[in-house]
């Protein structure tokens, strides 16, 4: 058993049918010595008396808010949560496996640049009685500071019969140098509590591996005289690291017809312009990627040919 | 990546082309190592990230773009020097182009070159003959060193008398390649910045 926060405790259980569970001793936080009784949650049934209460925690029915009283007055509370270990592996019931970029990916994180700021998000089908707390650091043995905000509900989607909820959090490394070569990964730890169930999820990454630039901005077309060709131009996104000559991007320019089946023409360039043939009803899209370290491509920025 | 490669014109900053080749070569070598050594811990998540140049060179600090010198987090142990020499500086004047930066890059390349050659000698003794260093990568390191044209004493190739542990050697190869790729990215960024200055 360990303390998650003041008066909230997590009991780790080897989870299988007929498991013996864990013996837990609760102590009433009071100078009083006698006349103390214990109850669980809203029930008025007295579970025991005395300054300590010994319980055998086996299932969720044994978890909850234990309260010690004296003469109708509440003295203190202890909330017991359960953390299930199923065949040597901690349970992952609360969050959905996003399966991208690989199986067992519960937390996904992205950074728009090398400033040390990044966003993580996760999915769940649970809508109520759910709380998250996020911590992060650079490295784990001698951790360096990363500050994370509160996790917030960022999107709701309907998937088949189920509603899916997306939560996200923004974090910022306390002293980040955009040009630094990372040797210790960022660690992100999310504590999730649903009703009386506790779970924790972790992700470990280098900022360089989660970079996804914003799409190029100010995408414009300039027709070339007496030609079906157009000059496409764009700019680096505002959120990208500077100077751009050091943090350079490379670009992919795509001409896509109305129908998804039509052949796509693609050109790769390090410049911020390109000359392409603009077909009728087609659209031109441009996306960006770090020129020297191949992390994710940005989303497409698009303009119609007409 | 099937990106078109821009060939620099002769007047252009001469080291840019070499540094681009270096990054391409080390990335290809790392990809090959990860595929060939699939049963070894060779992915970024599995290896320890060690930097053989740590405390010996200071490339990141010495080559920091001027715009980032205002960022205190980037200024741990920055010694700035604006003296320029070395053939890459081909008569281009800018306060950023410092000899310290380019000589630091040169020292990095020299250290990696020695490590890779020593390692290759060990890998050639492996009866499995599973993986060897790409000669093209070694050649590209050499070309960039020549383009930098710094004179420094030659580091003797390390020779080891004991029987090599091939498993450990292959894991060390992965560690070295990951670290060298990261350094090659920094070198490419620096050369691109110098070229634009």
């Amino acid at each position: 058993i360990w303390e998650l926060k003041k008066d909230v405790y997590v009991v780790e259980l080897d989870w299988y049918p007929d498991a013996p569970g864990e013996m837990v001793v609760l102590t009433c936080d009071t100078p009083e010595e006698d006349g103390i009784t214990w109850t669980l949650d809203q029930s008025s049934e007295v579970l025991g008396s005395g300054k300590t209460l010994t319980i055998q925690v086996k299932e969720f029915g044994d978890a909850g808010q234990y309260t010690c009283h004296k003469g109708g007055e509440v003295l203190s509370h202890s909330l017991l949560l359960l953390h299930k270990k199923e065949d040597g592996i901690w349970s992952t019931d609360i969050l959905k496996d996003q399966k991208e970029p690989k199986n067992k990916t519960f937390l996904r994180c992205e950074a728009k640049n090398y400033s040390g700021r990044f966003t993580c998000w996760w999915l769940t089908t649970i809508s109520t009685d759910l709380t998250f707390s996020v911590k992060s650091s650079r490295g784990s043995s001698d951790p360096q500071g990363v500050t994370c905000g509160a996790a917030t509900l960022s999107a709701e989607r309907v998937r088949g019969d189920n509603k899916e909820y997306e939560y996200s959090v923004e974090c910022q490394e306390d002293s980040a140098c955009p040009a630094a070569e990372e040797s210790l990964p960022i660690e992100v730890m999310v504590d999730a509590v649903h009703k009386l169930k506790y779970e924790n999820y972790t992700s470990s990454f280098f900022i360089r591996d989660i970079i996804k630039p914003d799409p190029p901005k100010n995408l414009q077309l300039k027709p070339l005289k007496n030609s079906r060709q157009v000059e496409v131009s764009w700019e680096y996104p505002d959120t990208w690291s500077t100077p751009h000559s050091y943090f350079s991007l490379t670009f992919c320019v795509q001409v896509q017809g109305k129908s998804k089946r039509e052949k796509k023409d693609r050109v790769f360039t390090d410049k911020t312009s390109a000359t392409v043939i603009c077909r009728k009803n087609a659209s031109i899209s441009v996306r960006a990627q770090d020129r020297y370290y191949s992390s994710s491509w940005s989303e497409w920025a698009s303009v119609p040919c007409s | 990546r099937n990106l078109p490669v821009a060939t620099p014109d002769p007047g252009m900053f001469p080291c840019l082309h070499h540094s681009q080749n270096l990054l391409r070569a080390v990335s290809n070598m790392l990809q090959k190592a990860r595929q060939t050594l699939e049963f070894y811990p060779c992915t970024s998540e599995e290896i320890d990230h060690e930097d053989i140049t740590k405390d010996k060179t200071s490339t990141v600090e010495a080559c920091l773009p001027l715009e980032l010198t205002k960022n205190e987090s980037c200024l741990n142990s920055r010694e700035t020097s604006f003296i320029t020499n070395g053939s890459c500086l081909a008569s281009r004047k800018t306060s950023f182009m410092m000899a310290l930066c380019l000589s630091s890059i040169y020292e990095d390349l020299k250290m990696y070159q020695v490590e890779f050659k020593t390692m290759n000698a060990k890998l050639l003794m492996d009866p499995k003959r599973q993986i060897f260093l790409d000669q093209n990568m070694l050649a590209v390191i050499d070309e960039l060193m020549q383009a930098l044209n710094f004179n420094s004493e030659t580091v003797p190739q390390k020779s080891s008398l004991e029987e090599p542990d091939f498993y450990k050697t292959k894991i060390k190869l992965c560690i070295l390649l990951h670290a060298f790729r990261i350094r090659a990215v920094t070198i490419d960024r620096v050369m691109s910045y110098l070229n634009a200055s």
Epitope: D14, W15, Y16, P17, E86, D87, G88, I89, D93, K104 | -
Partner: antibody, heavy 115, light 112 residues
């Protein structure tokens, strides 16, 4: 004590369907994940499928994906395996099993796919 | 399709020490715990070892398990006639959990 009693096995022709049941008693069935495992005659153990305690997630072996469906009725304390488009290579003893460091197995039920 | 490899058979005389190996990879045994089962003819498998080296109550202490790197082994110290059975190791793969990965199985024969 924990008991898993299986039923529903038998002889079936290729291409036909069969549903296996596993009735659980002696524990809070709705709190635990459950597996199906099979063993072809004279062969080793092969995992078939898994279902979470609440039925929210189901996982299948590639060899049965799209043909077999694992389900549970927590109000009846019963686990099911619906098997469709049966093939000769599905002939095996099928076991249900609890998920956990200490597991409990059903007695097994024989499924024979033969024309 | 078996990823965990066991020797097809091992044998020993009563009182001898018999060991069965189970060889896997970094993503399964290297990252997860190992179980061992005993299966007597015509019966369901019985758990012998969980969490690599833990014995459930009721399992004789002549059975012991160990794990090192990407391999695990089961030892029967002082093998007895009633130990003649098939033995299976089981683990998970970190990418496909909770799918069970079983070993190929080993037939233990007690001679004499």
């Amino acid at each position: 004590q924990v008991q898993l009693v299986q039923s529903g096995g038998g002889v079936v022709q290729p291409g036909r369907s069969l549903r296996l049941s596993c009735a659980a008693s002696g524990f809070t069935f709705s709190s635990y994940g459950m597996h199906w495992v099979r063993q072809a005659p004279g062969k080793g153990l092969e995992w078939v499928a898994f279902i979470r305690y609440d039925g929210s997630n189901k996982y299948y072996a590639d060899s049965v994906k799209g043909r077999f469906t694992i389900s549970r009725d927590n109000s009846k304390n019963t686990l099911y395996l619906q098997m469709k488009s049966l093939r000769a290579e599905d002939t095996a003893v099928y076991y249900c099993k609890t998920h956990g460091s200490h597991d409990n197995w059903g007695q097994g039920t024989m499924v024979t796919v033969s024309s | 399709s078996y990823v965990l490899t066991q020797p097809p058979s091992v044998s020993g005389t009563p009182g001898q020490r018999v060991t069965i190996s189970c060889s896997g990879g970094r993503s399964n045994i290297g990252s997860n715990t190992v179980k061992w089962y005993q299966q007597l003819p015509g019966t369901a498998p019985k758990l012998l070892i969980y969490w690599n080296d833990q014995r459930p109550s009721g399992v004789p202490d002549r059975f012991s398990g160990s794990k090192s790197g990407t391999s695990a082994s089961l030892a029967i110290t002082g093998v007895q006639a009633e130990d003649e059975a098939d033995y299976y190791c089981q683990s998970y793969d970190r990418g496909t959990h909770p799918a069970l990965l079983f070993g190929t199985g080993t037939k233990v024969t007690v001679l004499g």
